[in-house]
Amino acid sequence: QDSPPQILVHPQDQLFQGPGPARMSCQASGQPPPTIRWLLNGQPLSMVPPDPHHLLPDGTLLLLQPPARGHAHDGQALSTDLGVYTCEASNRLGTAVSRGARLSVAVLREDFQIQPRDMVAVVGEQFTLECGPPWGHPEPTVSWWKDGKPLALQPGRHTVSGGSLLMARAEKSDEGTYMCVATNSAGHRESRAARVSIQEPQDYTEPVELLAVRIQLENVTLLNPDPAEGPKPRPAVWLSWKVSGPAAPAQSYTALFRTQTAPGGQGAPWAEELLAGWQSAELGGLHWGQDYEFKVRPSSGRARGPDSNVLLLRLPEKV
């Protein structure tokens, strides 16, 4: 019994990977058996040389080489996009049209968004090498190489996240030249080589007297904005504190500050800023309209003394 065409197998999105050919499938039912016709971006394909398309008896479209890209269609602007193919199955009772299948070509651009930088890390501490790969279709994967060989990632010690390499605990053996490699089906690109030097931690004996230091944070005062900083300067405060205990054991003082969250809420992490003073100092880089907590911590080399009391200050919306 005669029946109109129905598409049974729709063409699928494809990535053209040289040297080709690419195949687009289309199968249809119907009585009499329907004839298959292919369209590219809505235009029928001629199938006559030098057209690179070829129709097989079962309705499959063979693409021997990527078609020349005409004008960008349907808002497309990337050289990766070769067009949308649809097939039509027709008999005397009607025509069925398949879903559109996009044909694209693999591309890997040359410019890295972020190149890894030379750096110095300390034994036992963590460090990160950043890498932002070039744009690619399909999206490239990132791997890391050290001294010309693929880096063997050790679980718990190495993490690759968003292209960047995180080293949990630096070891002397981590010293060397690192390179980030972006790879997809179009090929691969290498970043610049970044030199990583690993230093031993500074030897120190923790000054026992530092533990006996007592810091009293006495005052936190909002400073008047400097007119030279333009129309919207960031607020700064003046911290003043008193030190009691052994005679001046601290080599430096650090301000710890954070925005206050709602009562019972998870506290924000403390930000740290080295202070340029031994009893008072300015602290900048704050934000208007926030409630802040401040405290001061003494330190000598890598040793840290106990934190001071905490003082609160509400910064107005803007001065």
């Epitope: 808002g75 996009r102 694209s104 651009r109 040359e110 410019d111 968004q113 744009w135 999206e139």
Partner: antibody, heavy 118, light 112 residues
């Protein structure tokens, strides 16, 4: 025709959170990197975030790093910007924009307004 | 960060005149592959920015040839050969060579 439509803006208190969305149509969303750009009340433009076509790679300026997260749903043709620990200086009109490779932003949405104030 | 400085802040011109806007970067925008990613945008009040010029000197589709971009390294220029009524608004430069991407402060082209 390329269309980008932002939504989700509003008034938020300092320290609060908000999620912006951008619905894309008229192009194959999954092959394009996307960005968020904001325009301050003083009309300065500031780049806020960029995400790669597949969503694996994200980039931010220091001013929003750790507070804002850009993401995308390629099946739904939607771009997102999750913002937390909002500050008064985040007050701006937020635009989503399409990227050609990582070379230039060619099409921009009409924007959605965020106001951070107590 | 690459700080982008646009001059002048405001540019009063008469219809038919030539206008020239400068954009200077605090560091070279040419990357290690010799590519320079400096783009120019135009914005009218209440509208979103529109791309005019990409990669220093390439006109975006539909942009008239009255607009031209030039420059290299740290110094870039946008020229409008014969200013027409629809050209009045604000022009921005944007560099995407270095992360973070940075915009110039804008130049307002206004009627003299």
């Amino acid at each position: 025709e390329v269309q980008l439509v932002e939504s989700g803006g509003g008034l938020v208190k300092p320290g609060g959170s908000l999620k912006l969305s951008c619905a894309a149509s008229g192009f194959t969303f999954s092959t394009y990197a996307m960005s968020w750009v904001r325009q301050t009340p003083e009309k300065r433009l500031e780049w806020v975030a960029t995400i790669s076509n597949g969503g694996t790679y994200t980039y931010y300026p220091d001013s929003v790093k750790g507070r804002f997260t850009i993401s995308r749903d390629n099946a739904e043709n939607t771009l997102y910007l999750q913002m937390s620990s909002l500050r008064s200086e985040d007050t701006a009109m937020y635009f989503c924009a399409r990227l050609i490779y990582y070379d230039y932003l060619d099409y921009w949405g009409h924007g959605t307004t965020l106001t951070v104030s107590s | 960060d690459a700080v982008m400085t646009q001059t002048p802040l405001s540019l009063p011109v008469s219809l038919g005149d030539q206008a020239s806007i400068s954009c200077r970067s605090s560091q070279s925008l040419e990357n290690s592959n010799g590519n320079t990613y400096l783009n120019w945008y135009f914005q009218k009040p209440g509208q979103s920015p529109q791309l005019l010029i990409y990669r220093v000197s390439n006109r975006f589709s539909g942009v008239l040839d009255r607009f031209s971009g030039s420059g290299s390294g740290t110094d870039f220029t946008l020229k409008i050969s014969r200013v027409e009524a629809e050209d009045f608004g604000v022009y921005f430069c944007l560099q995407v060579t270095h992360v973070p991407w940075t915009f110039g402060g804008g130049t307002k082209l206004e009627i003299k």
